[in-house]
């Protein structure tokens, strides 16, 4: 059977910046900002696009040693990322795969809403364990907040490159950043 679980969460971080860090550079960021959750991410095949296989290893003490993810879609325009957990972790006798979709939607205040869909494909008439869904959400929460905290502390990271810096302008004129574009954007 297929069991679909959907959740939404918010972030004060602009959508484009969050997509760049959390989705496009998660492989590098996660072990750095959340070593208690992920110890390493290794590209087994592919270059990050559809068909790429990644091996995510977890630190000792966590229930699972690793999972393998297959990238299904990366939509840079709509900030959408589809991937499937295809091996390791909970995948086994009762669970065939978990198809995941993350969409980051810009909000009028300059932040974002993350819309997350997790489809558990079970074998036969097996059901999904509630604790597995909870553990998955908790992992997602840990990674998102760790990345978010990193971005809040490093304002220059994962922003569009600026050709002229504020210093070059003598500090008199402030360049418009992605965040400034949303500044006092009232709807």
């Amino acid at each position: 059977g297929v069991f679909n679980y959907e959740t939404e969460t918010t972030s004060v971080i602009p959508a484009a910046r969050l997509f760049k860090a959390f989705i496009l550079d998660g492989d590098n960021l996660f072990p750095k900002v959340a070593p208690q959750a992920i110890s390493s991410v290794e590209n087994i095949e592919g270059n990050g696009g559809p068909g790429t296989i990644k091996k995510i290893s977890f630190p000792e003490g966590l229930p699972f040693k690793y999972v393998k993810d297959r990238v299904d879609e990366v939509d840079h325009t709509n900030f959408k990322y589809n991937y499937a957990v295809i091996e390791g972790g909970p995948i086994g006798d009762t669970l065939e795969k978990i198809s995941n979709e993350i969409k980051i939607v810009a909000t009028p205040d300059g932040g974002s809403i993350l819309k997350i869909s997790n489809k558990y494909h079970t074998k036969g008439d097996h059901e999904v364990k509630a604790e597995q869904v909870k553990a998955s959400k908790e992992m997602g929460e840990t990674l998102l907040r760790a990345v978010e905290s990193y971005l809040l502390a490093h304002s220059d990271a994962y922003n569009e490159q600026k050709l002229i810096s504020e210093e070059d302008l003598g500090g008199e004129q402030k360049l418009i950043s992605e965040e400034d574009l949303h500044h006092h954007h009232h709807h």
């Epitope: 959740t7 969460t9 932040g111 809403i113 905290s149 954007h185």
Partner: antibody, heavy 122, light 108 residues
Framework: QVQLVQSGAEVKKPGASVKVSCKAS????????LHWVRQAPGQGLEWMGL????????YYTQKFQGRVTMTRDTSIDTAYMELNSLRSDDTAIYYC???????????????WGQGTMVTVSS | DIQMTQSPSSLSASVGDRVTITCRAS??????LNWYQQKPGKAPKLLIY???SLQSGVPSRFSGSGSGTDFTLTISSLQPEDFATYYC??????????FGQGTRLEIK
């Protein structure tokens, strides 16, 4: 501990403006949305809008559009809500509330200020 | 905007009673429903978020259930400190956020 402390009660005349402050402490101010909710005497809760303290951006409900401005000063971890062209039916307690920031739900109000009573009377 | 309707508007109950308050949304809001308790002269307090998750520090006699359009808040055994007004609030997808009109719980 985590708390929001609001400015004191205000008495205003119709047509005037009021600016209520909300001082945050005990957490990273820029990481959590701040909401403004009001409650007229003996009435229910009414959401006015939200402020993103990181970007400075905001969202106001249609009812308050053009009359309300939500701002912040990150150097002192304080949010402000200014309401213009006050009318007698704006008499209410105004609350600031911090978002829970949960992976399970957007926009749940976890921490509340003590409220600021604004009375509009001629 | 999504309308939230609570029932009953008020109810009288005794200490030890099991009490249920319902909240209905004008359209499906998935599980994006929160419950608050407000005592006279005080700010509201978050009890339940995401329809059924108990907020940290809230006694386990409070529970929430429901999904889609119909939700309930249950107090399994009323305590003297539970007499207050209860509000439901939806936060489906994007603003505007709306509250129910409130349910006043009084001592019988």
């Amino acid at each position: 501990q985590v708390q929001l402390v609001q400015s004191g009660a205000e008495v205003k005349k119709p047509g005037a403006s009021v600016k209520v402050s909300c001082k945050a402490s005990g957490y990273t101010f820029i990481a959590y949305y701040l909401h403004w909710v009001r409650q007229a005497p003996g009435q229910g809760l009414e959401w006015m809008g939200l402020l993103n303290p990181y970007t400075g951006g905001s969202y106001y409900t249609q009812k308050f559009q053009g009359r309300v401005t939500m701002t912040r000063d990150t150097s002192i971890d304080t949010a402000y809500m200014e309401l213009n062209s006050l009318r007698s039916d704006d008499t209410a307690i105004y609350y600031c509330a911090r978002d829970k920031r949960s992976y399970y739900i957007p926009y749940a109000f976890e921490i509340w200020g003590q409220g600021t009573m604004v009375t509009v009377s001629s | 905007d999504i309308q939230m309707t609570q029932s009953p508007s008020s109810l009288s109950a005794s200490v030890g009673d099991r009490v249920t308050i319902t909240c209905r949304a004008s359209q499906s809001i998935s599980s994006y429903l929160n419950w608050y308790q407000q005592k006279p002269g005080k700010a509201p307090k978050l009890l339940i978020y995401a329809a059924s998750s108990l907020q940290s520090g809230v006694p386990s006699r409070f529970s929430g259930s429901g999904s889609g359009t119909d939700f309930t808040l249950t107090i399994s055994s009323l305590q003297p400190e539970d007499f207050a007004t209860y509000y439901c609030q939806q936060s489906y997808s994007t603003p505007p956020i709306t509250f129910g009109q409130g349910t006043r719980l009084e001592i019988k």
